[in-house]
């Protein structure tokens, strides 16, 4: 795997350049994304600009075209006119994209986290992880607070009360997921520690209930079972711990680290190929979903204020709050950073899946925004698993919406409970099968709100969930950008860099191999353990 040569240091401490990623050099990050920013002037420059941003433009166009195509087909008779077979065929190109992206997730998450964890010394790993989790926690809490505030201000529930004109419309208890809050969090813990790594690749643990007759009394007994769906949380935890363990092995583990890094690189090559198919897939994913929906107009008329509340909240958090946090800490233009990740954001909207967007997000933050590989590949998979700003915001809006709809009061204690539970359960959503709706049920149970109306939330979940996913992945990317900035600052502030450092007992005189004539900064130095490790590293085992 390609690594920049370490810089010699008189004290025997070798600071490995945090650009050790074969990507753009640090400091050039603004220039990198500047190509996206200023594209005016001569026709030549416009052509260059279009070529440089072709994929971004195609992806955005795909979303717009998808909406247009979907509405067009709906107007021409929609799902009824197409029939089930034709509808499946119509949605097929989108399904293909999802399958391609999901195919990549497992090797990508496991290899990138093992490589990322192994490439950082334990202290740096701990600091990076702690800062990342703090950022994720704070932004999720802010999203939750924004959701509650908006819902209390706009009162979507009172406006939508008419949708509930009959009890049947509200849905029944049988439809609403009924699971003990404690069992949900126990399932989360169980999924963090999978009993079988192979089955964790496609199954998760979930508690269900059986009614048993015990001494004449019917008792609800919890029964554990494996359900379909990758246990990404368990895989993430295992990969990080395994990476740390490999690093602890020292030279003995280097071969395996190099293997995982190479596997990771190969996976990213596949991602770069898939990226060019993304616009086609996204167009049909969006169009297919619109065609599938019946009475979209009626749904908007009835639940319009709730949808508005969710989308407005996502827009405020994604376009103002997160960029503001990024700007305050980095003093860099956050919108330039966002432009660099438009393709994965559009993919997030199209696929409605954080993990499916992960491969593209890694590629874009590394290549367009200059985030070092060991940061992006460590932080982004964790973010995709635990950082769910969009989900937390939607759940808070939904909880307040349901309270207003059923005319149930929300005092200060209940509001705080909603905030805390939404934040906690959004973190755990990846470890709880049937994610969003079940976690919403947990929040409602926590504040004694009716679960009858969850079916109303489900009716518009296809749209709100897309917006949630966009915000979720944006938060992950900006978190990676912030951490990159933190690493840059700690390196430039210290002669013995705090984060990416390798102690050496031998003098080093590596031979850099230039890879690009025009850029002397981009050199490959082949360290055996990939990013941020050097051949002669003799760090004592922890």
């Amino acid at each position: 795997m390609a690594v920049d040569p370490p810089k010699a240091d008189p004290k025997g401490v070798v600071a490995v350049d945090s650009t050790a990623n074969g990507g753009p050099a640090l400091g050039s990050r603004e220039d990198q994304s500047a190509k996206a920013g200023g594209c005016c002037g001569s026709r030549d420059r416009v052509r260059r600009c279009i070529r440089a941003n072709l994929l971004v433009l195609l992806t955005v166009a795909a979303v717009v075209a998808g909406v247009g195509l979907g509405l067009g087909v709906s107007a021409a008779g929609g799902a009824d006119a197409l029939g089930p077979a034709r509808l499946t065929a119509f949605a097929f190109p989108g399904e293909l994209l999802l399958r391609l992206l999901k195919m990549i997730i497992l090797p990508l998450v496991v290899c990138s986290l093992i490589g990322g964890a192994a490439s950082l010394d334990p202290g740096a790993l701990g600091r990076l992880g702690a800062w990342a989790l703090l950022f994720f926690l704070v932004t999720t809490l802010l999203a939750s607070a924004l959701g509650v505030g908006l819902a209390l201000a706009l009162q979507p529930g009172a406006a939508s009360a008419a949708i509930n004109a009959s009890v049947g419309a509200a849905g029944s208890a049988e439809n609403a997921p009924s699971k003990e809050v404690l069992d949900s969090f126990l399932d989360l813990a169980r999924n963090i520690f999978p009993s079988n790594l192979v089955s964790a690749a496609f199954r998760s643990y979930s508690t269900t209930y059986e009614e048993r007759n015990i001494t004449g009394t019917r008792v609800k007994v919890p029964v554990g079972q494996e359900v379909e769906g990758m246990n990404i949380l368990g895989l993430v935890v295992f990969a990080i711990v395994f990476g740390v363990a490999l690093r602890k092995l020292g030279p003995e583990g280097e071969l395996l680290i190099r293997f995982f890094n190479s596997f990771n690189e190969a996976t990213m090559v596949l991602v770069s190929w898939i990226m060019w198919y993304a616009p086609v897939g996204i167009m049909f994913l969006v169009a297919g979903k619109i065609v599938e929906m019946e009475d979209v107009g009626l749904l908007f008329a009835r639940l319009g204020k709730y949808i508005l509340c969710c989308l407005l909240g996502h827009a405020i958090h994604g376009l103002l709050v997160l960029p503001l946090i990024y700007f305050l800490f980095t003093r860099k233009n956050p919108y330039r950073f966002l432009w660099g990740i438009v393709t994965p954001l559009a993919t997030a909207f199209g696929t409605s899946s954080s993990s499916a967007t992960l491969p593209l997000m890694m590629k874009c933050v590394e290549e367009n925004n200059g985030v070092a590989k060991h940061i992006s590949r460590f932080i982004l998979p964790i973010g995709a698993t635990v950082n769910m700003d969009g989900a937390a915001l939607f759940q808070c809006v939904a909880a307040v919406f349901i309270a207003q709809l059923s005319q149930q009061s929300l005092d200060f204690v209940k509001i705080i409970t909603i905030l805390v539970t939404a934040t906690a359960s959004s973190v755990g959503a990846a470890g709880i099968p049937a994610g969003g709706v079940l976690t919403l049920a947990i929040i409602l149970e926590a504040v004694n709100l009716p679960v009858d109306h969850i079916s109303l939330i489900l009716a518009v979940d296809w749209l709100v969930d897309r917006s949630c996913t966009v915000l979720n992945v944006e938060g992950d990317a900006l978190g990676a950008g912030l951490l990159q900035n933190y690493v840059d600052r700690t390196e430039s502030r210290s002669t013995e860099p705090e984060l990416i450092q390798v102690k050496s007992e031998l003098p080093l005189d590596p031979l850099p191999v230039p890879t690009e004539e025009g850029n002397p900064l981009l050199k490959h130095y082949r360290g055996p353990a990939g990013d941020a490790t050097v051949a002669s590293e003799k760090e004592s085992v922890m």
């Epitope: 009172a158 406006a159 009360a161 008419a162 509930n164 004109a165 009890v167 509200a170 029944s172 208890a173 609403a176 009924s178 209930y209 009614e211 609800k220 207003q404 709809l405 059923s406 005319q407 149930q408 009061s409 149970e445 004694n448 709100l449 009716p450 679960v451 009858d452």
Partner: antibody, heavy 120, light 107 residues
Framework: QIQLVQSGPELKKPGETVKISCKAS????????MSWVKQVPGKGLKWMGW????????IYGDDFKGRFAFSLETSASTAYLQINNVKNEDTATYFC?????????????WGQGTTLTVSS | DIQMTQTTSSLSASLGDRVTISCRAS??????LNWYQRKPHGTVKLLIY???RLHSGVPSRFSGSGSGTDYSLTISNLEQEDIATYFC?????????FGGGTKLEIK
């Protein structure tokens, strides 16, 4: 103190319309939903539905759609139950009950009940 | 709809007795069980909500317990004014449903 005062007993012929009132006092009327409950002589209580007093939207139980209508006069803190085209099986005592704003669906204060007798 | 069953339709007890009235739901109602008292030709009063919480102004001799599908109301020291019909009601999900009632009489 909180009180729900209902209108007096009614005697109606089949096919007529009846409107029962329920005047609330002692609390903010638009904060709590108002439910209607029916009790047939010698039988149990049956929930008819409720009205969202803030939005003014009625929600009806499955057996009470069509001839039954809930309405409000917010300025007078009064809820109404109107039964159109009354039938013999509508003979019962009708209660208005304030729906609690907590712990989902229960009724913390009740009116004294209005007896409706339908007889030809 | 969730069915609520009060197996005992009438109950005789002496003043000062400890009386227990039971109620069963057709499915788990997660403690959303409420108890009401209706005096003969009188109004209906809430006694207990959410299985065991005493409504304001209700004497402490009334208590509630239970979980899942089985619940009970206990009057620890029966008084003359407690002669009434007692209804249970589930508030877990729409539509709220009531038990058939248990009529309490003096022996």
């Amino acid at each position: 103190q909180i009180q729900l005062v209902q209108s007096g007993p009614e005697l109606k012929k089949p096919g007529e319309t009846v409107k029962i009132s329920c005047k609330a006092s002692g609390y903010t009327f638009t904060t709590f939903g108002m439910s209607w409950v029916k009790q047939v002589p010698g039988k149990g209580l049956k929930w008819m539905g409720w009205i969202h007093t803030y939005a003014g939207v009625p929600i009806y139980g499955d057996d009470f759609k069509g001839r039954f209508a809930f309405s409000l006069e917010t300025s007078a803190s009064t809820a109404y139950l109107q039964i159109n085209n009354v039938k013999n099986e509508d003979t019962a005592t009708y209660f208005c009950a304030r729906r609690s704003d907590n712990y989902r669906y229960f009724f913390d204060y009740w009116g004294q009940g209005t007896t409706l007798t339908v007889s030809s | 709809d969730i069915q609520m069953t009060q197996t005992t339709s009438s109950l005789s007890a002496s003043l000062g007795d400890r009386v227990t009235i039971s109620c069963r739901a057709s499915q788990d109602i997660r403690n959303y069980l409420n108890w009401y008292q209706r005096k003969p030709h009188g109004t209906v009063k809430l006694l207990i909500y959410y299985t065991s919480r005493l409504h304001s102004g209700v004497p402490s001799r009334f208590s509630g317990s239970g979980s899942g599908t089985d619940y009970s109301l206990t009057i620890s020291n029966l008084e003359q004014e407690d002669i009434a019909t007692y209804f249970c009601q589930q508030g877990h999900t729409l539509p709220p449903t009531f038990g058939g009632g248990t009529k309490l009489e003096i022996k």
